[in-house]
């Protein structure tokens, strides 16, 4: 979490972000929020990235005002304009690139002062696993699946029963390209799984870690999944 | 003994949405999870989704996610589906099974019609 | 999603016969399968899990065989008890699949 205070002048507002990831080739959040203003014309929106000359975002006199912006955020960003009113600067970025990392500023000015609050913003892929069991005549195993991850991941095993245990050994991780060239799709298989044991698949790199459980019984097959993102700082 | 109440039937109008209920007795109500299966008139069984009591944690089949929701109310042992902007097709005998499916409901029969 | 087949989808039989009912995998699925009985009313009941394994209050004459992608259900001596819709099912993999069914009826 950052909190960023006013400077001179005037006097100064609280303006508070939280560090974030963005998944490429979805929609992304950064978020700011400020003490809010009674009038909406009185807020000045700037959101600026570090490196990047023109303005990622402008929204002044309650409406967007894009004649600074970047070329490289044409028509890929948006307040939550109905609120503003009540103190939130969250930016929505579109179609996230890998290119979008690094460190964004959200500037305020409303009629009370100014203030500002850096963001880091992480960029890559993830997704949540699928843990199934896969059959072959010799042996049952378990296969764990994840559709996108970048940059590459480490992918262990764990299971209820032999808490502790190394499974390198007796698993097989995959990472295979996608068309776009940029993510992989994530393959694991454990062999020789026991019956009556709960086994997870725990992907993780630095923006993300999912879990894949699976029980598997005689009589059924339970299965969840978790996705965590990591490092969400607030500032 | 192990118990899945469904009400016998629902009438509802095309757009409309409908909450269909599972009320469950003579076991422990958060310790298996909850299954829902659908079969249309004169066709075999589809399955919807699962939901954990406890936690109320979902698996989906992507068929029907978005159009059906699974809810529980610990307080009541009860298992709910609510399907939203209803059309013809929808029109089936919805059915709620204890997991590991070994005990089903008997079914509730909706009905989509103006 | 995994295609669960069962070619027979009616078959008539005599009382006292032997049936059997066969349901096939289009990938391996191990012994994860279960067989329900669904009765004209519309009741359903889970008969045999695990390919093979009898569920309780479940008659012996039913019987359950297979391994990874081909399966079948067995009635030893058919009873008029037993006219119904048979229903295999993998649990194998997300999300869980039926066949199309098979309706049991008397000659």
């Known amino acids: 979490l950052i909190i960023g205070f006013g400077i001179s002048g005037r006097h100064s507002i609280t303006v508070t972000t939280v560090a974030s990831a963005g998944n490429i080739g979805e929609d992304g959040i950064l978020s700011c929020t400020f003490e809010p203003d009674i009038k909406l014309s009185d807020i000045v929106i700037q959101w600026l990235k570090e490196g990047v000359l023109g303005l990622v975002h402008e929204f002044k006199e309650g409406k967007d005002e894009l004649s600074e912006q970047d070329e490289m955020f044409r028509g890929r960003t948006a307040v939550f304009a109905d609120q503003v009113i009540v103190g939130n600067a969250s930016l929505r970025l579109k179609n996230v690139q890998l290119t979008d990392a690094g460190t964004y500023k959200c500037y305020i000015i409303t009629s009370k002062g100014k203030g500002n609050a850096n963001l880091e913003y992480k960029t890559g892929a993830f997704s949540m696993p699928e843990v199934n069991v896969d059959y072959n005549a010799s042996s049952e195993t378990l296969r764990c699946e994840a559709p996108r991850w970048f940059p590459q991941p480490t992918v262990v095993w764990a299971s209820q029963v032999d808490q502790g245990a190394n499974f390198s050994e007796v698993s097989n991780t995959s990472f295979e390209l996608n068309s776009e060239n940029v993510t992989m799709k994530v393959v694991s298989v454990l062999y020789n799984v026991t019956i009556n044991n709960t086994y997870s698949c725990m992907i993780e790199n630095d923006i993300a870690k999912a879990t894949g459980d699976i029980k598997v019984t005689e009589s059924e097959i339970k299965r969840r999944s978790h996705l965590q993102l990591l490092n969400s700082k607030a500032s | 003994q192990v118990q899945l109440r469904q009400p016998g039937a629902e009438l509802v109008k095309p757009g409309a949405s409908v909450k269909l209920s599972c009320k469950t007795s003579g076991y422990t109500f958060t310790s298996y999870w909850m299954h829902w299966v659908k079969q249309r008139p004169g066709q075999g069984l589809e399955w919807i989704g699962e939901i954990d009591p406890s936690d109320s944690y979902i698996n989906y089949n992507q068929k029907f996610k978005g159009e059906a929701t699974l809810t529980v109310d610990k307080s009541s042992s009860t298992a709910y589906m609510q399907l939203s902007s209803l059309t013809s097709e929808d029109s089936a005998v919805y059915y709620c099974?204890?997991?590991?499916?070994?005990?089903w409901g008997q079914g509730t029969t909706l009905t989509v019609s103006s | 999603d995994i295609q669960m087949t069962q070619t027979t989808s009616s078959l008539s039989a005599s009382l006292g016969d032997r049936v059997t009912i066969s349901c096939s995998a289009s990938q391996g699925i191990s012994n994860y399968l279960n067989w329900y009985q669904q009765k004209p009313d519309g009741t359903v009941k889970l008969l045999i899990y695990?390919?093979?394994r009898l569920h309780s209050g479940v008659p012996s004459r039913f019987s359950g065989s297979g391994s990874g992608t081909d399966f079948s259900l067995t009635i030893s001596n058919l009873e008029p008890e037993d006219i119904a819709t048979y229903y295999c099912?993998?649990?194998?993999?997300?999300?869980?699949?039926f066949g199309g069914g098979t309706k049991l009826e008397v000659k």
């Open positions: 695990y390919t093979s």
């Open positions: 099974a204890r997991g590991p499916r070994d005990y």
């Open positions: 099912q993998q649990y194998s993999k997300l999300p869980y699949t």
